[in-house]
């Protein structure tokens, strides 16, 4: 697994560098997670033809993956920092069950899948420190998550492969949209 942000060789080589600001740390954390997703997607795409499949829509209907929309305040038109930050944190919390599903779905990248999951938890903590209105953040219900996880794991092999591909693709897009919005804050 890649080295977490703040522990790379560049940081060791440059001890006199200014400490990272909160925004820079968040930016770096997202980029680190995106690297992990990229590695996981490589394994998924090498293992199956899901990345070229045109049957994505069939499987996508069964998943309720978080997605950015204009109403969330993260787009340029109608940009609202607090609303957007709440959407990002809520979305990441909703993704956690899907990231749990990804564990044990990878052979050669098992560590990487764990790193993505753990780094996402750290990112959520960073963002919660930044948010003023923590009350507006709804945490997913653990019972609902547990039954969703059971349902996903009970799918046939093809659907499990497709689900893995869709989770990685959607999570990547959500993080990129978040990265874009956070740079405006």
């Amino acid at each position: 697994a890649p080295v977490p942000p703040g522990e790379d060789s560049k940081d060791v080589a440059a001890p006199h560098r200014q400490p990272l600001t909160s925004s820079e740390r968040i930016d770096k954390q997202i980029r680190y997670i995106l690297d992990g997703i990229s590695a996981l997607r490589k394994e998924t795409c090498n293992k199956s033809n899901m990345c070229e499949s045109s049957k994505e829509a069939l499987a996508e209907n069964n998943l309720n993956l978080p997605k950015m929309a204009e109403k969330d305040g993260c787009f340029q038109s109608g940009f609202n920092e607090e609303t957007c930050l709440v959407k990002i944190i809520t979305g990441l919390l909703e993704f956690e069950v899907y990231l749990e599903y990804l564990q044990n779905r990878f052979e050669s990248s098992e560590e990487q899948a764990r790193a993505v999951q753990m780094s996402t938890k750290v990112l959520i903590q960073f963002l919660q420190k930044k948010a003023k209105n923590l009350d507006a953040i709804t945490t997913p219900d653990p019972t609902t998550n547990a039954s969703l996880l059971t349902k996903l794991q009970a799918q046939n092999q093809w659907l499990q492969d497709m689900t893995t591909h869709l989770i990685l693709r959607s999570f990547k897009e959500f993080l990129q949209s978040s990265l874009r919005a956070l740079r405006q804050m």
Epitope: R31, F75, Q76, S77, E173, S177
Partner: antibody, heavy 119, light 107 residues
């Protein structure tokens, strides 16, 4: 392979609206991390970024020209359109469209059209 | 807006020279810095992205370095075809901004 091509009028009268079209191939807006932008270059001068549109239809504009610019896209036709209102002789320039694509949204413009000169 | 300042404005070189082009940002832009080459009557071409990442098809004599707000593009042995204008670009925050360019010419 990736290609972009700009088209539009070569001559525009003052106060008129300029409409430029960028037709591209070799990539699509279905891929997250993709954006297409417009950049202009007055004769003998430096590059100036104008506007950009993302894979999910979010947009960014140059603050100094924001009130005059509109960027839209047609994903089915693989094209991006830029309109610029209230044209003035100082808007004389070569207008380029260019693509940016990377996971981190670094906005490095890796492919450019040939440009279209608007006077 | 982040202002990108390039120096020198013009650089006269002899083929085989090693040259350095400077670019300074008015505030820290981390590693969101890209270099372009524009030859006469041509579109700009991406040379280096994210300070030092090489681009497929670009000769290895081009390299980039720097961090924060000070950046350098180096050409380790100038070829006659390297003549043109070199621009740096801020990719950190909007509006995206370019430097005024450094013109590379032969003596």
């Amino acid at each position: 392979q990736v290609t972009l091509k700009e088209s539009g009028p070569t001559l525009v009268k003052p106060t008129q609206t300029l409409t430029l079209t960028c037709i591209f191939s070799g990539f699509s807006f279905k891929t997250s991390g993709v954006s297409v932008g417009w950049i202009r270059q007055p004769p003998g001068k430096a590059l100036e970024w104008l506007a950009l549109i993302y894979w999910d239809d979010d947009k960014r504009y140059s603050p100094s020209l924001k009130n005059r610019l509109t960027i839209t896209r047609d994903t089915s036709k693989n094209q991006v359109v830029l309109t610029m209102t209230n044209m003035d002789p100082v808007d004389t320039a070569t207008y380029y469209c260019a693509r940016s694509y990377d996971d981190y949204l670094y906005y490095a413009l890796d492919y450019w059209g040939q440009g279209t000169l608007v006077t | 807006d982040i202002v990108m300042t390039q120096s020198p404005a013009t650089l006269s070189v002899t083929p085989g020279d090693r040259v350095s082009l400077s670019c300074r940002a008015s505030q820290s832009i981390s590693d969101y810095l890209h270099w372009y080459q524009q030859k006469s009557h041509e579109s700009p071409r991406l040379l280096i992205k994210s300070v030092s990442q090489s681009i497929s098809g670009i000769p290895s004599r081009f390299s980039g370095s720097g961090s924060g707000s000070d950046f350098t593009l180096s050409i380790n042995s100038v070829e006659p075809e390297d003549v043109g204008v070199y621009y740096c670009q801020n990719g950190h925050s909007f509006p995206l901004t370019f430097g005024a360019g450094t013109k590379l010419e032969l003596k």
